[in-house]
């Protein structure tokens, strides 16, 4: 058993039929010695008396808010949550496996630049009685600070018969050094509590591996005289790290016909302009990627050829 | 060229060669990002290779103030990786494919380090500890880890030279 926060405790249980469970001793936080009784949740049934209560925790019915009283007055509470371990593996019932970029990916994170700011998100089908708490650090043995905000519900989607809820959190490394080469990964730890079930999820990454620039901005076309060619120009996204002479991007320019089956013409360039042939009813799209490190491409910025 | 007393390197040549190094490092080991070897007890290996750290003066301001600190750091790292790529981790079994870019990568590391340190000029002699012997199954993992680290190292070096070529060239 360990303390998650004040008066909230997590009991770690090996979860299998007829498991013996864990013996837990609760102590009433009071100077009183006599006349103390214990109850669980809203029940008025007295579970025991005395300053300590010994219970055998085996299942969710044994978890919940234990309260000690004296003469009708509440003295203190202890909330017991359960963390299940099945076949040596901690349960992952609360969050959905996003399966990208690999199986057992529950947390996904992205950064728009090298400032040390990043966003993580996760999915669940649970709509109520759900709380999340997020902690992060750079490295684990001698951790350096990363500050995370509160996790918020950022999207709701219907998937077949189910509703899916997306939660996200923003974090910022306290002393980020955008130009340095990371040697210790960022660690992100999410505590999830659904009713009386506790689970924890972790992710470990370098900012450089989760970089995904915003799409290029101000995408414009300039027809060239007496030609089907156009000059496409764009700018670095506002959110990208500066100076751009140091934090450089490379770009992919694509001409795509109306039909998805039509052949795509692609040009790669380090410049912020390119000359392409604009076909009727086609569109021109540009996306960006770090020039020197192959992290994710941005989403496409697009304009119609006409 | 980076000479004692602080004259400039051939920024544009360094820029071109470092960008080539980035391309080679990724073609030598194209798996992007999340093939996560930190699960393989990777901490030691990533700690054993060079890193360009915050105080090395490789940020835009540090380069403007005195690029020599950063250039020396990059030079040390290039020599270090050049020795690793020339060791039996890469030359031993299992043999690399004949068209593997590792050979080119090795030569380019040497080429860039020589651009930074021409004949007749010596930063302190580079010492590298004895390498632990490795078995073929260990080498595959070590190659993977070294190339992943090298990708990150040369990315920072390429940024330095691109910025230098754009803002510090005579």
């Amino acid at each position: 058993i360990w303390e998650l926060k004040k008066d909230v405790y997590v009991v770690e249980l090996d979860w299998y039929p007829d498991a013996p469970g864990e013996m837990v001793v609760l102590t009433c936080d009071t100077p009183e010695e006599d006349g103390i009784t214990w109850t669980l949740d809203q029940s008025s049934e007295v579970l025991g008396s005395g300053k300590t209560l010994t219970i055998q925790v085996k299942e969710f019915g044994d978890a919940g808010q234990y309260t000690c009283h004296k003469g009708g007055e509440v003295l203190s509470h202890s909330l017991l949550l359960l963390h299940k371990k099945e076949d040596g593996i901690w349960s992952t019932d609360i969050l959905k496996d996003q399966k990208e970029p690999k199986n057992k990916t529950f947390l996904r994170c992205e950064a728009k630049n090298y400032s040390g700011r990043f966003t993580c998100w996760w999915l669940t089908t649970i709509s109520t009685d759900l709380t999340f708490s997020v902690k992060s650090s750079r490295g684990s043995s001698d951790p350096q600070g990363v500050t995370c905000g509160a996790a918020t519900l950022s999207a709701e989607r219907v998937r077949g018969d189910n509703k899916e809820y997306e939660y996200s959190v923003e974090c910022q490394e306290d002393s980020a050094c955008p130009a340095a080469e990371e040697s210790l990964p960022i660690e992100v730890m999410v505590d999830a509590v659904h009713k009386l079930k506790y689970e924890n999820y972790t992710s470990s990454f370098f900012i450089r591996d989760i970089i995904k620039p915003d799409p290029p901005k101000n995408l414009q076309l300039k027809p060239l005289k007496n030609s089907r060619q156009v000059e496409v120009s764009w700018e670095y996204p506002d959110t990208w790290s500066t100076p751009h002479s140091y934090f450089s991007l490379t770009f992919c320019v694509q001409v795509q016909g109306k039909s998805k089956r039509e052949k795509k013409d692609r040009v790669f360039t380090d410049k912020t302009s390119a000359t392409v042939i604009c076909r009727k009813n086609a569109s021109i799209s540009v996306r960006a990627q770090d020039r020197y490190y192959s992290s994710s491409w941005s989403e496409w910025a697009s304009v119609p050829c006409s | 060229r980076a000479v004692p007393g602080g004259s400039s390197p051939a920024w544009t040549q360094c820029q071109q060669l470092s960008q080539k190094l980035c391309t080679l490092a990724w073609s030598a080991h194209p798996l992007v990002g999340h093939m996560d070897l930190r699960e393989e007890g990777d901490e030691e290996t990533t700690n054993d290779v060079p890193h360009i750290q915050c105080g090395d003066g490789c940020d835009p301001q540090g380069l403007r103030d005195n690029s020599q600190f950063c250039l020396q750091r990059i030079h040390q790292g290039l020599i270090f990786y050049e020795k690793l790529l020339g060791s039996d981790i890469f030359t031993g079994e299992p043999s690399l494919l004949p068209d593997s870019p590792v050979g080119q990568l090795h030569a380019s590391l040497l080429g860039l380090s020589q651009l930074l340190q021409p004949e007749g000029h010596h930063w302190e002699t580079q010492q590298i500890p004895s390498l632990s012997p490795s078995q073929p199954w260990q080498r595959l993992l070590l190659r993977f880890k070294i190339l992943r680290s090298l990708q990150a190292f040369v990315a920072v070096a390429a940024r330095v030279f691109a910025h230098g070529a754009a803002t510090l060239s005579p």
Partner: antibody, heavy 120, light 113 residues
Framework: EVQLQQWGAGLLKPSETLSLTCAVY????????VHWIRQPPGKGLEWIGV???????DYNSVLKSRVTISVDTSKNQFSLKLSSVTAADTAVYYC??????????????WGQGTLVTVSS | EIVLTQSPATLSLSPGERATLSCKPS????????????LAWYQQKPGQAPRLLIY???TRQSGIPDRFSGSGSGTDFTLTISRLEPEDFAVYYC?????????FGGGTKVEIK
């Protein structure tokens, strides 16, 4: 909990073969090299040899012709054999581990030591 | 092989005093590429195995009191015990693992004055 436990014959006659075993607990043999080190009474420490995670060995050149280090991975046990011992081989013998990495490591955990006396 | 010379051979001090132990290798133990010095310090008490105090010249092993500190680089290293406690009286060895064979210094005995 990481532990290295040693045992073996404590009293030998000259020309016999010293044989010691070191059983390891609490860590993976894939991640650590195992070494043998000795210390003659009242003297300093001398490295004898190492068995690397891949199974290859390296020995101190002074002892190379007489020493063999081996591993039984099924039992998580390492053994040291030193042939043709003389009184100069009287020492406390230790096994120790270091983490396998690109470069040789330092010894973070040691066995309790076994005193071997060579006397006629 | 790399030879490590420790000095002094014996250091006679009283509890509460500061101890400064030196270890000088015959060649540099600094790998400038990764900025690591491949040197460790050990404490050994009679009848016990050596105990790791410091690795990479200056990193304290977990569980070692902060009165122990390591410093130096290249060919000159120092172990400092800021205030000697009664349990610190022992023999201290340095170890190099830059090249194999691994080699130890001859040791410095810190004794009660």
């Amino acid at each position: 909990e990481v532990q290295l436990q040693q045992w073996g014959a404590g009293l030998l006659k000259p020309s016999e073969t010293l044989s010691l075993t070191c059983a390891v607990y609490g860590f993976s043999l894939i991640s650590y090299n195992v070494h043998w080190i000795r210390q003659p009474p009242g003297k300093g420490l001398e490295w004898i040899g190492v068995i690397w995670t891949g199974g290859s060995t390296d020995y101190n050149s002074v002892l190379k012709s007489r020493v063999t280090i081996s591993v039984d991975t099924s039992k998580n046990q390492f053994s040291l054999k030193l042939s043709s011992v003389t009184a100069a081989d009287t020492a406390v013998y230790y096994c120790a581990r270091d983490k396998y990495g690109l470069f040789p490591g330092y010894f973070d955990y040691w066995g309790q030591g076994t005193l071997v006396t060579v006397s006629s | 092989e790399i030879v490590l010379t420790q000095s002094p051979a014996t250091l006679s001090l009283s509890p509460g005093e500061r101890a400064t132990l030196s270890c000088k290798p015959s060649q540099s133990l600094l790998s400038s590429g990764n900025r690591k010095n491949y040197l460790a310090w050990y404490q050994q008490k009679p009848g016990q195995a050596p105990r790791l105090l410091i690795y990479y010249a200056s990193t304290r092993q977990s569980g070692i009191p902060d009165r122990f500190s390591g410093s130096g680089s290249g060919t000159d290293f120092t172990l400092t015990i800021s205030r000697l406690e009664p349990e610190d009286f022992a023999v201290y060895y340095c170890l190099q693992h830059f090249n194999y064979p691994w080699t130890f210094g001859g040791g410095t005995k810190v004794e009660i004055k």
